[in-house]
Interface confidence: medium
């Protein structure tokens, strides 16, 4: 008989895990960019749109050099959870105008969920403290009008785009330290 089977294996080395997390983040960034362009084509944005409930951008590109792995992953996970919640809200309460963004919005939600699970596994593999699940956040108020829903969509996709762009840069930089 051959050698005894090794221990049961769960998944790749965390560095390989980080590689695939970067790939998934890049692909999500491309999806978001495409969806934002689709939204602009259908409903041109008149200036910048903000939504108070969205997280503030985590980091300027210039400050990336000082990043520490635990802080980046914790902050990124928290921000992406917020965006996931906003995308779910948009699909539920955004009104009939935004139905034209389906099924792409649904695909975006599923990929965002997958990225969050990947980040969670990466954090646990490295033995970084896992924040306990957040208490249920108060529900987001429905948009006041159809145009309110469109403005919210511009803000959500724009913010997610910036966050994912920051995430790709941050994760690539962290890879050199792992």
């Amino acid at each position: 008989p051959g050698p005894p089977p090794g221990p049961p294996r769960v998944s790749p080395d965390p560095r390989a895990e980080l590689d695939s997390t970067v790939l998934l983040t890049r692909s999500l960034l491309a999806d978001t960019r495409q969806l934002a362009a689709q939204l602009r084509d259908k409903f041109p944005a008149d200036g910048d749109h903000n939504l108070d409930s969205l997280p503030t951008l985590a980091m300027s590109a210039g400050a990336l050099g000082a990043l520490q792995l635990p802080g980046v992953l914790t902050r990124l996970r928290a921000d992406l959870l917020s965006y996931l919640r906003h995308v779910q809200w948009l699909r539920r309460a955004g009104g009939s105008s935004l139905k034209t963004l389906e099924p792409e919005l649904g695909t975006l939600q599923a990929r965002l969920d997958r990225l969050l699970r990947r980040l969670q596994l990466l954090m646990s593999r490295l033995a970084l403290p896992q924040p306990p699940p957040d208490p249920p956040a108060p529900p987001l108020a429905p948009p006041s009008s159809a145009w309110g829903g469109i403005r919210a969509a511009h803000a959500i996709l724009g913010g997610l785009h910036l966050t994912l762009d920051w995430a790709v840069r941050g994760l690539l930089l962290l890879k050199t330290r792992l």
């Epitope: 221990p7 792995l69 490295l126 970084l128 896992q130 306990p132």
Partner: antibody, heavy 118, light 110 residues
Framework: EVQLVESGGGLVQPGGSLRLSCAAS????????MHWVRQAPGKGLEWVAV????????YYADSVKGRFTISRDNSKNTLYLQMNSLRAEDTAVYYC???????????WGQGTTVTVSS | QSALTQPASVSGSPGQSITISCTGT?????????VSWYQQHPGKAPKLMIY???HRPSGVSNRFSGSKSGNAASLTISGVQAEDGADYYC??????????FGGGTQLTVL
């Protein structure tokens, strides 16, 4: 082959100290968090301590807090457990284990026996 | 850091399905989907059978499955075989970033 090998166990008197080592091979040690888990004779598994991939985060069971210190040397692919003020109830087989998921440990050493007795 | 609660022993005949329960609190099992199960034969190191509540590592038989509801988790072995006779331990990540094990369950295959 992915492997963990513990050493450093032995007989020690109550109040004494011992340092356990766990040599890792076959994987990128510096990319994984690591645990120590113990098992007293005829008893169940008891979690002892965990250390993050770079040594910056360490957590301990209440029963060993202030007496045991977990550390690692990534340049030597080695995990350590410094045990001070040992008590009879610390008598056990001590295992090091690699983190696979938050509490999941997919690679274990063969264990090293620590006996605390006068 | 109280141990998770498991039955001391369970038994079953070959081919039967058996379930081992593991009860914790809202600070461990109830807080995360981070529950693992280990098999340990006498004199051997534990072996990971289930992680993250219901995920099976490669190389573990699909007869082993895990689930969770509230503050309790369970391991089910379908079509139990003689070689499954061993001690089984559950464990959970906690809100203190520590890990807690169950007291262990001895599975006897009749």
């Amino acid at each position: 082959e992915v492997q963990l090998v513990e050493s450093g166990g032995g007989l020690v008197q109550p109040g004494g100290s011992l340092r356990l080592s766990c040599a890792a091979s076959g994987f990128t040690f510096s990319s994984y968090g690591m645990h120590w888990v113990r098992q007293a004779p005829g008893k169940g598994l008891e979690w002892v301590a965990v250390i993050s991939y770079d040594g910056s985060n360490k957590y301990y069971a209440d029963s060993v807090k202030g007496r045991f210190t977990i550390s690692r040397d990534n340049s030597k692919n080695t995990l350590y457990l410094q045990m001070n003020s040992l008590r009879a109830e610390d008598t056990a087989v001590y295992y090091c284990a690699r983190i696979a998921a938050a509490d999941g440990m997919d690679v274990w050493g063969q264990g090293t026996t620590v006996t605390v007795s006068s | 850091q109280s141990a998770l609660t498991q039955p001391a022993s369970v038994s079953g005949s070959p081919g039967q399905s058996i379930t081992i329960s593991c009860t914790g609190t809202s600070s461990d099992i109830g807080a995360y989907n981070y529950v693992s199960w280990y098999q340990q034969h006498p004199g051997k190191a534990p072996k990971l059978m289930i992680y993250d509540v219901s995920h099976r590592p490669s190389g573990v038989s699909n007869r082993f499955s895990g689930s969770k509801s509230g503050n309790a988790a369970s391991l089910t072995i379908s079509g139990v075989q003689a070689e499954d006779g061993a001690d089984y331990y559950c464990s959970s990540y906690t809100t203190s970033s520590t890990v807690v094990f169950g007291g262990g369950t001895q599975l006897t295959v009749l």
